[in-house]
Structures are given as structure tokens and as C-alpha cells.
């Protein structure tokens, strides 16, 4: 698949005549028809097997044709083909005269031909333009042409299809000859095979994208070159997956039986001697002055637990010292500090013991705070009242005293004088800065539209059958809105019973 491109450059018809010799009046409005076909030793009109294209009127008599390719125009002319370019061609270029705007053959004069040229030959696919000039008795045409491959087609005949892609089916761009060029990190005939992380084990590792190393079952590590030992293997290694070869000093199926606890754990403290006495068992032989299973205890005055109330004993060179927990004091932590029994909470606060009575916490009533409820809360400190409202402390709460024209908990709402709908008889209410004003409908007046100025046409109850009466204020007439089942200007007729008119 490719495109034969024809670039018309200049047409000369100095005398402004047709092929017949007849002058065009006032000039030859020239357009071109191009026919591209298979190679013929003698080029003749007929089926344009490779394609045909026409131009609009490009000029009159003699003119240069500008390159329109940048603006998506018609020059160069494009003759696409969807087959392998054969390397040879025939080309017919006709110049025609169109007196009007209709360029269809049947709309042209019977002698509309200005000139025709026919060429044939070999043409290889390539970017370079071939320049040609054809001269007849009265005209001259300069043009150039070339064949290029369509997008995604490559090779000497535009027959090799290659569309760059980067998806599951391949990761490549196309070389000028149409061969694939793999994107970095991909290999294989169609660049579908990722190149794994450098050093990734060939057998034990694989990858689904470049620079990756995913391990096959039984293998681990950055390069999948480390075997995974048997599940639960504690102190063992493997040379192939799922093995568990025990380290020295360990035994059992999972190498979790400690045959050398002394070496592995050094459990004996303070310079004691450790002796293995079977699986996970040992004996510590303490140095003088120490005791305990691991010889961790120093024999001292604290052994008699002299500290009370949870105090901790610390050995000192000249005796011992008790560290008392909160709420206790004294040599042996025998004295207690304040508790709920001492009523430490002010202003009606409730006392709650904490840490088994060692200390306490006060729960304060509203308006009081502090660890002993000794501070009074001022609820007006945050200026909560809007629009100049005054904040007042009222026992456990606060309130806002609003300026005239405002309401709401925080004086945040503007009071509309119209909110009460003060205008009667459908009057329209207008808020003013210091009051309101009513605009009254026709038939009413007064500050609140309370005064009727026209006759109420409904006063005489002219509507029958419980119809609703409306006064038309503009005409002082009435309109009856009939209930279901009645008709007539006064709703006087039941539906279905035609009125008996006197005429």
C-alpha cells in the first residue's frame, strides 16, 4: 500500500487556446485530470487501473501551482494504491477548460480539452521527486512525481506491513526496510520476549516484563538462585528446594530441636557456668552471691521485700532504697498521699479513684474546669454573637442579646419585615431600611392594600354548584371555576345534558 504523488508546478498556455486551436473566452480556466495505470508500451486512455484524481480550476491560461501540502490541500495530488507497487506505471495528465463551476465531463464544452500528456516508465519507491516537463504545440507543463509507502508499509514495493506496537503482541518500532526493531528490554522474532534482570537464573527464574526476575516454585532471592528449604525448617539449609539440612547443634525433621542450648542462647547470667542437659534444657552453676535458674538474682537486703504498697527495692552499698509508686511515700512507701477520701474536687465536682486508689480524677460540672474544678468557664470569651449581639453568661449556658433587625441563636439571621406577609390582597412587599412598603394590585389601596377600591363582582355569588368565583380586577367581572361534572359560564349545566337553548 502506498501513494503516487504528483506535484503540478507550472502550466503555460500563452495563447489561451484549446487543443483544437479555438481560443477560450475570456481565458482558459484550467483544471487537470490525472489517470494512473499499469505500464503500457503505448499509453492509451481507458481504465485508470491505479487510480484517478481531478483538481479544481487552478488558474487561467498560464500559471504556477503552489504547493498546498502543508495546508492539507490538493498539491501534491495523491493517488493511493493498496497493492504491491510494481515499479512501472503509465500516467496521463489532461488539462481541461471549464467555462463554469461545474467540472463534470458532461457539463464541459464538447471541445474542452486544452492538452494531454502521456508518460510511462519505471519508478522505484523513494522520497526523491522526479522532475519532468512536457511540451506540446501550444502548451507546456512542468511537474514532479514520486511513490512513497503508506503509513505502516515498508520495503521496495511497499508490501511489507509493519505497525509499531507496545502491547502483549509485541514491543517494537519499524526499520526503514520494514524489519522490526525491538524496544529496549525486549527480544525474540516479534519482540514479545522480555529480557529478564541481568543474572536472573535461566532455569529457576523468569520474567513477564523487562528487568524483572520472578522465581519458579522452590526458589527465591533477587536472582532466583537461592533454594527455599522445607516449610518450617528452623535451623537448616537446602541445596535443592524443600530440603532441610540441619545446622550444627540442631536436630529433628525441621532442625528445631536445640542440641546446644548453652551455645545458642547463653542463658546463664553473672558469670555462671552453663551445661547442656538434653533438648532445650540446661543447668546454670552460679557464682557465689547469685541465685535463680539463670543465676540472675543477686543475694541482698532487698530479698526480704521491705517496700510496701508496690514499691520497688533497689540495692545500695549501705543498704537499700524504696522507689514508691504515685500516691505513696515514706521509707517503706507506707504513707498515702491525697485520695477521694480527702474531697479534693471543688464546685460540686465528682471524685473518681484511679489506680486502685493511688490517685484520683475530678469530673467537673458545666462552667467549671481544672484538675480540681477550681476554674470557672467563661463562655463569652470567643465572641460568638454576630451582628453586634451582646453575649451574656447564664449559669451553665450563654445567650446572645440581638440588636434590632436580627434574630437567631447567634443573631445571625436578618429579620425581614416582609416575612409576616403584611400586604393584603396579593400586594407585593418591599423591605426598606427602616420599614416596609406594599405595592397593591388593581382594586386595592392603603399602606397594607387593605382598602378595596373596586366593586367585588363575586359579591353576588353568581356561580352555581359550589363553583369557585374569581374577580377579574382589571375588568370588574367574575370567572367561575367549575367543579367536576359541570360546565357553563356560571357552572349551571351538568356535563352530558345539553342545554336547551331558546333558539
Amino acid at each position: 500500500s502506498g501513494v503516487f504523488q504528483l506535484q503540478l508546478q507550472e502550466f503555460i498556455n500563452e495563447r489561451g487556446v484549446l487543443a483544437s486551436g479555438r481560443p477560450c473566452e475570456p481565458g482558459c480556466r484550467t483544471f487537470f485530470r490525472v489517470c494512473l495505470k499499469h505500464f503500457q508500451a503505448v499509453v492509451s486512455p481507458g481504465p485508470c487501473t491505479f487510480g484517478t484524481v481531478s483538481t479544481p480550476v487552478l488558474g487561467t491560461n498560464s500559471f504556477a501551482v503552489r504547493d498546498d501540502s502543508s495546508g492539507g490541500g490538493r498539491n501534491p495530488l495523491q493517488l493511493p494504491f493498496n497493492f504491491t507497487w510494481p515499479g512501472t506505471f503509465s500516467l496521463i495528465i489532461e488539462a481541461w477548460h471549464a467555462p463554469g463551476d461545474d467540472l463534470r465531463p458532461e457539463a464541459l464544452p464538447p471541445d474542452a480539452l486544452i492538452s494531454k500528456i502521456a508518460i510511462q516508465g519505471s519508478l522505484a519507491v523513494g522520497q526523491n521527486w522526479l522532475l519532468d516537463e512536457q511540451t506540446s504545440t501550444l502548451t507546456r507543463l512542468r511537474y514532479s512525481y514520486r511513490v512513497i509507502c503508506s503509513d505502516n508499509y515498508y520495503g521496495d514495493n511497499c508490501s511489507r506491513l509493519c505497525k509499531k506496537r507496545n502491547d502483549h503482541f509485541g514491543h517494537y518500532v519499524c526499520q526503514p526496510d520494514g524489519n522490526l526493531s525491538c524496544l529496549p528490554g525486549w527480544t525474540g522474532e516479534y519482540c514479545q520476549q522480555p529480557i529478564c534482570l541481568s543474572g536472573c537464573h535461566e532455569q529457576n527464574g523468569y520474567c513477564s516484563k523487562p528487568a524483572e526476575c520472578l522465581c519458579r516454585p522452590g526458589w527465591q532471592g533477587r536472582l532466583c538462585n537461592e533454594c527455599i528449604p522445607h516449610n518450617g525448617c528452623r535451623h537448616g539449609t537446602c541445596s535443592t528446594p524443600w530440603q532441610c539440612t540441619c545446622d550444627e547443634g540442631w536436630g529433628g525433621l525441621f532442625c528445631d530441636q536445640d542440641l546446644n542450648y548453652c551455645t545458642h542462647h547463653s542463658p546463664c547470667k553473672n558469670g555462671a557456668t552453663c551445661s547442656n542437659s538434653g533438648q532445650r534444657s540446661y543447668t546454670c552453676t552460679c557464682r557465689p552471691g547469685y541465685t535463680g535458674v539463670d543465676c540472675e538474682l543477686e543475694l541482698s537486703e532487698c530479698d526480704s521485700n521491705p517496700c510496701r504498697n508496690g514499691g520497688s527495692c533497689k540495692d545500695q552499698e549501705d543498704g537499700y532504697h524504696c522507689l514508691c509508686p504515685p500516691g505513696y511515700y515514706g521509707l517503706h512507701c507506707e504513707h498515702s498521699t491525697l485520695s477521694c477520701a480527702d474531697s479534693p474536687c471543688f464546685n460540686g465536682g465528682s471524685c473518681r479513684e484511679r489506680n486502685q486508689g493511688a490517685n484520683y480524677a475530678c469530673e467537673c460540672p458545666p462552667n467549671f474546669t481544672g484538675s480540681n474544678c477550681e476554674k470557672k468557664v467563661d463562655r463569652c470569651t470567643s465572641n460568638p454573637c454576630a451582628n453586634g449581639g451582646q453575649c451574656l453568661n447564664r449559669g451553665p449556658s450563654r445567650m446572645c442579646r440581638c440588636r434590632p433587625g436580627f434574630t437567631g441563636t447567634y443573631c445571625e439571621l436578618h429579620v425581614s419585615d416582609c416575612a409576616r406577609n403584611p400586604c393584603a390582597h396579593g400586594g407585593t412587599c418591599h423591605d426598606l431600611e427602616n420599614g416596609l412598603m406594599c405595592t397593591c394590585p388593581a382594586g386595592f389601596s392603603g399602606r397594607r392594600c387593605e382598602v378595596r377600591t373596586s366593586i367585588d363582582a363575586c359579591a353576588s355569588s353568581p356561580c352555581f354548584n359550589r363553583a369557585t368565583c374569581y374577580t377579574d380586577l382589571s375588568t370588574d367581572t367574575f370567572v367561575c371555576n367549575c367543579p367536576y361534572g359541570f360546565v357553563g359560564s356560571r357552572c349551571e349545566f351538568p356535563v352530558g345534558l345539553p342545554p336547551s337553548f331558546p333558539w
Epitope: A19, S44, P45, L108, P109, P110
Partner: antibody, heavy 119, light 106 residues
Framework: EVQLVESGGGLVQPGGSLRLSCAAS????????MSWVRQAPGKGLEWVAM????????YYADSVKGRFTISRDNSKNTLYLQLNSLRAEDTAVYYC????????????WGQGTMVTVSS | SYELTQPPSVSVSPGQTASITCSAD??????VSWYQQKPGQSPVLVIY???KRPSGIPERFSGSNSGNTATLTISGTQTMDEADYLC?????????FGGGTKLTVL
């Protein structure tokens, strides 16, 4: 069916006049150039006159210039040839022909009508 | 004036190829049409624009035009092809016909 039917031929004396008609059907008459071509007995074809689709352009052979007039009435789909100052050498079968646009030639011909100029 | 010259007659055997020429100065720069006319009948367009066939004309009719000569070729000639053949082109605002060639199929 595309068709051209000539009429109006006959015997006329030298110096006399005739009006030939050609009724067109089966195609868009007002879109095409039309022509008259004649053929003397035993001779070849000779082009006589041509008219553009809208009647604004007319061409004549030198041999009939000033004597013959080509015209058309697109509303009636009819082509005319007014023959004046007839001569013996104008004796021929007169064909009406539709001219194909763009050097196609004459793609539809009528059956012809005979004009005889004789005293 | 511009004249199109044709041979008066051409003979051919059935099934053979017949070639009828039409000559004029620089004729190859113009388009040529060919007509077939049988005795007592109106002409019929068989080739236009040098080599194109109207619909309904058999493929055995072909044409070419270059230099000073246009050629009508009938390959595999049949007896029904026996007729007068006339070429036509343009000179200035005149339609020009050749004198015609009588094709005889022997």
C-alpha cells in the same frame, strides 16, 4: 430510452427555407450541447452547427454560416435548425446529435431527416 | 483547413485484426472519436478520447493516437463489423470528420 427524433425535412426549391426539429427524450436535454450533422447521398459526414446547453454559444460550419440558424427550446426538449437560402449542395440527410462534454464526440444520433433542394 | 485523412477501404478476413488509420498534423495532441455507420443507418460512437469504449461496444474495438496518426483496431473481426468507419476531431471551433473507410470482411 435515450432518443432523438428529427422532423421537418422535405423537398424545397433553391433559395427556399425549411425548419428542422429534433425532439429529445430519455436524458436531461438542458444539460447537454447539441449538434446538427449532415450526410450528402453517397458521401461522408459533414458537421453543420452546434449549440451550448443553454443556447448562449453557437458554432457553424463555414459552408452554412449566415444561412442556417441553430436554436433550442429547453422547456420543450427540442433542437431546431432553420435553413434559409437553400442550395442544391445542401441536399442531405440531416442528423441531430447529442455532443458529449469534454471531447467525447457525438454519443447519441437521431435517425435523420432528408432535405432535398431541387427545382 | 484541418483535414482528417482516412484510407477509402480496408479488407480483412473474419477473425483477423483490422486497422483503420486517421492522419492529420499533430493529431496526437488532440482527442479522436470513431464512428461506425452501416448502410441506411445513423452513425454509432464506438471509440472516444482516442481509446475509450462507450458501454455496449464490444471489447474487440480499441483505439490509439500518437504523433500524427490515430488508429482504430478491430481484433477478431466479425462479418457484422462490415461498415463505414469515420474518425472525428476538432479544429478551432469546427468539428472535423474524416472521409470514412469502408471495412470489408471477406
Amino acid at each position: 430510452e435515450v432518443q432523438l427524433v428529427e422532423s421537418g425535412g422535405g423537398l424545397v426549391q433553391p433559395g427556399g427555407s425549411l425548419r428542422l426539429s429534433c425532439a429529445a427524450s430519455g436524458f436531461t436535454f438542458q444539460s447537454h450541447w447539441m449538434s446538427w450533422v449532415r450526410q450528402a447521398p453517397g458521401k461522408g459526414l459533414e458537421w453543420v452547427a452546434m449549440i451550448s446547453y443553454d443556447g448562449t454559444i453557437k458554432y457553424y460550419a463555414d459552408s452554412v454560416k449566415g444561412r442556417f440558424t441553430i436554436s433550442r427550446d429547453n422547456s420543450k426538449n427540442t433542437l431546431y435548425l432553420q435553413l434559409n437560402s437553400l442550395r442544391a449542395e445542401d441536399t442531405a440527410v440531416y442528423y441531430c446529435a447529442k455532443a458529449g462534454g469534454g471531447n467525447v464526440g457525438f454519443d447519441i444520433w437521431g435517425q435523420g431527416t432528408m432535405v432535398t433542394v431541387s427545382s | 483547413s484541418y483535414e482528417l485523412t482516412q484510407p477509402p477501404s480496408v479488407s480483412v478476413s473474419p477473425g483477423q485484426t483490422a486497422s483503420i488509420t486517421c492522419s492529420a498534423d499533430k493529431l496526437g495532441t488532440k482527442y479522436v472519436s470513431w464512428y461506425q455507420q452501416k448502410p441506411g443507418q445513423s452513425p454509432v460512437l464506438v471509440i472516444y478520447q482516442d481509446a475509450k469504449r462507450p458501454s455496449g461496444i464490444p471489447e474487440r474495438f480499441s483505439g490509439s493516437n500518437s504523433g500524427n496518426t490515430a488508429t482504430l483496431t478491430i481484433s477478431g473481426t466479425q462479418t457484422m463489423d462490415e461498415a463505414d468507419y469515420l474518425c472525428q476531431s476538432w479544429d478551432r471551433s469546427d468539428v472535423v470528420f474524416g472521409g470514412g473507410t469502408k471495412l470489408t470482411v471477406l
